[in-house]
C-alpha cells in the first residue's frame, strides 16, 4: 500500500515538474491606476493556448461568407472562460467593490490581477505592489505581532494604527503577553473572527499600492464588520487603491466604482448612482429586501445570485463596457474597441520579468478545521528598513535555476527508476528581458501610515504588443538546451490548487 501511495505521490510530482513554468508579474512603480481591459481567462490548464491556436486557425481559414464567429461558437464546447471580456479602471486611492453571483469569478478576478491566473486575452495594468487578503483567514505559528508584521519592517505607529482599525486592541489586551502571545503549535487557539481580523491586519499592514480584499469580513458580526469597514477600509486606507469583494449594499454605496459579475461576465460597471439609474429594477430589488445587509453572507450571495440570474433570463442584459460608457462615463478613450491580445500567451510572446525575487513561504501553516489555501506573500518589492528594493544575492541570470531543475529531474529519475530519462521535457521558450526597479525613499509625514516606504509613483504597462520576429535576433537565447524550470512559488501554487 505504501508503495502504491509513493508511486501516486511521485507521479503527481513528476506531473508538476513537467508543467509550464509559472511566471511572476513584472511591475513598475510609476503606474498609479489599475486597469483591466477586455480580459478573458480560463482556469482549465491549456485553454489559453487552445484559445490562441483556435483563433489563429480561424483567422487563417475564414468561412466563405466572411463570418468569423465560427471559432467562438465551437469554442464554447471546449471550455467556459471563468472571466469574459472584463473591463474596469480605477484611479489611485479609489475603492472598487466587486459583487456578483456565486461562482461568478470574483476571486478569479483577483487571481488575474495577482498573476495567479494568466488571461488568454486582454490587458492588465497596475504597479505590481500588491497586498492580498484571502477570504480564508490563516495563521502561522508565532506571535500575534509576527503574524501581522509577517517579515515587513516594524513601524510601531503603523502597526498600532492597523491593530486599532481592525479592532484587535481589545482582544490583545486580554492576554497577559499582549501581542507576544503565541498562536498555534502549543499556543492559543483563536476564534474565527479573531483569525479573520489578524489576516486583514496582515494585509493592511503591508505597504502596497493595491489592496485586494477577498470577502475579508468572514466570521464577523454585522456591527463589527461595519465598524472595521469604516475604520480600516474607508479611513485608514483612504489614500490606497482597494478592490473589495463583497455582497453588502453598504459597501457598494461607499465604493467609488462597482463591478457586478455574473457567470464570468460584467453585468454592470459604474458608480452606485449609475447602477440605480441604469438598472433600477435590479438595484431596487436588492435594496427592497428588508435588512439585506443584516443577512448572512451565504444568504446575501444566494439572493444576489438568484436576482442576477432572473434579470439575465428576463433579457435585462448585462450592461457592456461600451454601452455604459456611452450612457454615463466621461472617460478618456483609453479602451479601444479593437481587442488587444496584450497580456500575450507565453507560447508566442516575449515576457518581461523582474529580477526581484519573492520570498518563499514557510510550509508550516496552521490550518485549523479548514482546507483553506495558504496566502502567498506577494511582496514584489521586499521590504527593508531603508525601504529600498533588495536585489537577490545570487545572480538570477546565471544558470542557477537550470541546475536546480536538472537536479530535481535527476532526483525524480532516481526515485522512479525512470526509463524515460531521455524523454524530452525541454521546451522552446522565448527570451526574456529582466529589469530592476529601485524605489527611492519618499520623505513623507506620519499622517500616512504607509509613508515609511512609499515608493515613487511610477507606469508599467504589463503587456504591450510586441512583434516577436523583430526582436528575435536581438534577444535570442539558445533555450533548447535548458530544461523546464520549476520554482518554489510554482510548487506552492500547485499544491494549493490541487490540495485534496
Amino acid at each position: 500500500q505504501t508503495w502504491y501511495d509513493s508511486l501516486g505521490a511521485i507521479n503527481k510530482i513528476q506531473d508538476f515538474l513537467q508543467k509550464q513554468e509559472y511566471k511572476t508579474l513584472e511591475y513598475n512603480l510609476t503606474t498609479t491606476e489599475v486597469v483591466m481591459e477586455n480580459v478573458t481567462a480560463f482556469w482549465e490548464e491549456g485553454f489559453g493556448e487552445l484559445f490562441e491556436k483556435a483563433k489563429q486557425n480561424n483567422n487563417n481559414r475564414k468561412t466563405s461568407n466572411g463570418d468569423d464567429s465560427l471559432f467562438f461558437s465551437n469554442f464554447s464546447l471546449l471550455g467556459t472562460p471563468v472571466l469574459k471580456d472584463i473591463n474596469f479602471k480605477i484611479e489611485r486611492g479609489q475603492l472598487l467593490a466587486v459583487a456578483g453571483s456565486t461562482g461568478a469569478g470574483k476571486t478569479s478576478l483577483l487571481m488575474v490581477i495577482m498573476g495567479e491566473l494568466e488571461p488568454s486575452e486582454g490587458k492588465i495594468k497596475h504597479s505590481g505592489r500588491i497586498s492580498f487578503c484571502s477570504q480564508f483567514s490563516w495563521i502561522m505559528p508565532g506571535t500575534i505581532k509576527e503574524n501581522i508584521i509577517f517579515g515587513v519592517s516594524y513601524d510601531e505607529y503603523r502597526y498600532r494604527s492597523v491593530i486599532k482599525a481592525c479592532q484587535l486592541e481589545e482582544d490583545i489586551s486580554k492576554f497577559a503577553e499582549k501581542d507576544n502571545i503565541v498562536l498555534g503549535e502549543g499556543g492559543i487557539t483563536l476564534s474565527g473572527g479573531q483569525r479573520a481580523r489578524i489576516s486583514l491586519a496582515r494585509a493592511v499592514y503591508k505597504d502596497a499600492d493595491l489592496y485586494l480584499l477577498d470577502s475579508p469580513f468572514g466570521y464577523l458580526d454585522v456591527l463589527t464588520e461595519k465598524e472595521i469597514f469604516e475604520s480600516c477600509v474607508c479611513k485608514l486606507m483612504a489614500n490606497k487603491t482597494r478592490i473589495l469583494v463583497t455582497s453588502k449594499m453598504e459597501h457598494l454605496k461607499k465604493a467609488d466604482k462597482i463591478l457586478i459579475l455574473h457567470e464570468g461576465s460584467s453585468y454592470f460597471y459604474g458608480t452606485f448612482s449609475e447602477l440605480q439609474n441604469l438598472q433600477p429594477d435590479f438595484s431596487s430589488k436588492l435594496m427592497g429586501c428588508d435588512s439585506f445587509d443584516q443577512f448572512s453572507a451565504e444568504r446575501r450571495n444566494s439572493i444576489l445570485t438568484e436576482t442576477l440570474h432572473r434579470f439575465s433570463l428576463e433579457g435585462d442584459a448585462p450592461v457592456s463596457w461600451t454601452e455604459t460608457k456611452k450612457q454615463s462615463f466621461k472617460q478618456t478613450g483609453e479602451f479601444g474597441e479593437k481587442r488587444k491580445n496584450s497580456i500575450l500567451n507565453p507560447i508566442n510572446s516575449i515576457r518581461k520579468f523582474s529580477i526581484v525575487q519573492k520570498t518563499p513561504l514557510q510550509m508550516n501553516g496552521i490550518e485549523e478545521d479548514s482546507d483553506e489555501p495558504l496566502e502567498r506573500r506577494l511582496s514584489l518589492v521586499p521590504d527593508s528598513e531603508q525601504g529600498e528594493a533588495i536585489l537577490p544575492r545570487i545572480s538570477v541570470i546565471s544558470t542557477g535555476p537550470t541546475l536546480q531543475a536538472r537536479r530535481r529531474q535527476s532526483v525524480l529519475n532516481l526515485m522512479t527508476h525512470s526509463v524515460n530519462q531521455g524523454q524530452n521535457i525541454h521546451r522552446k521558450t522565448t527570451a526574456s528581458t529582466r529589469k530592476v526597479s529601485l524605489a527611492p525613499q519618499a520623505n513623507l509625514t506620519e499622517l500616512d501610515i504607509y509613508s515609511r516606504r512609499l515608493s515613487q509613483e511610477t507606469g508599467l504597462e504589463i503587456s504591450e504588443e510586441i512583434n516577436e520576429e523583430d526582436l528575435k535576433e536581438c534577444f535570442f537565447d539558445d533555450m533548447e538546451s535548458i530544461p523546464a524550470v520549476t520554482t518554489w512559488n510554482t510548487y506552492l501554487r500547485y499544491i494549493t490548487v490541487h490540495k485534496s
Epitope: E156, Y157, R160, S161, I163, K164, E169, I172, S173, F175, A176, E177, K178, D179, N180
Partner: nanobody, 123 residues
Framework: QVQLQESGGGLVQAGGSLRLSCTAS????????MGWFRQAPGKEREFVAT????????DYADSVKGRFTISRDNAKNTVYLQMNSLKPEDTAVYYC????????????????WGQGTQVTVSS
C-alpha cells in the same frame, strides 16, 4: 494586571530639576503607551507627556515642551519624566498611567494609574 509605582517627587527651587520614575509590574510592558499626568489643587487632571510602546513617538503638553523629557526603559519596565527649568505653576501631584490604546493624550483612555507623587516648586 499592571501596577504602577511613581517615585522621585519632592520639593525643589524654581529653575531646578527633578526626575520622576514609574515602575510597572506585570508582563508586556512594551505594549502599553505610558503617560504622565498632573493635578494641581482645585484643578482638573491634565496631560503632561506620553511615550509610545517602543519609545519611537513622544508627545508633550504645550506648557512643558522644551523643559520636560519623557523616556522609557522596557528592560526595566520603567518610564521616566525628566523635569528641567521647573516653575511654581508645575506644582502638582504627578501621576503615571498606562494605556493599551494607541495613541492618546486623553486621561480617559488610560486603563491603569499609579498613586501619584507630589512635586512642589517653590519660588
Amino acid at each position: 494586571q499592571v501596577q504602577l509605582q511613581e517615585s522621585g517627587g519632592g520639593l525643589v527651587q524654581a529653575g531646578g530639576s527633578l526626575r520622576l520614575s514609574c515602575t510597572a509590574s506585570g508582563r508586556a510592558f512594551s505594549w502599553y503607551v505610558m503617560g504622565w499626568f498632573r493635578q494641581a489643587p482645585g484643578k482638573e487632571r491634565e496631560f503632561v507627556a506620553t511615550v509610545s510602546g517602543n519609545g519611537s513617538r513622544r508627545d508633550y503638553a504645550d506648557s512643558v515642551k522644551g523643559r520636560f523629557t519623557i523616556s522609557r526603559d522596557n528592560a526595566k519596565n520603567t518610564v521616566y519624566l525628566q523635569m528641567n527649568s521647573l516653575k511654581p505653576e508645575d506644582t502638582a501631584v504627578y501621576y503615571c498611567a498606562a494605556s493599551s490604546t494607541y495613541y492618546y493624550t486623553d486621561p480617559e483612555k488610560y486603563d491603569y494609574w499609579g498613586q501619584g507623587t507630589q512635586v512642589t516648586v517653590s519660588s
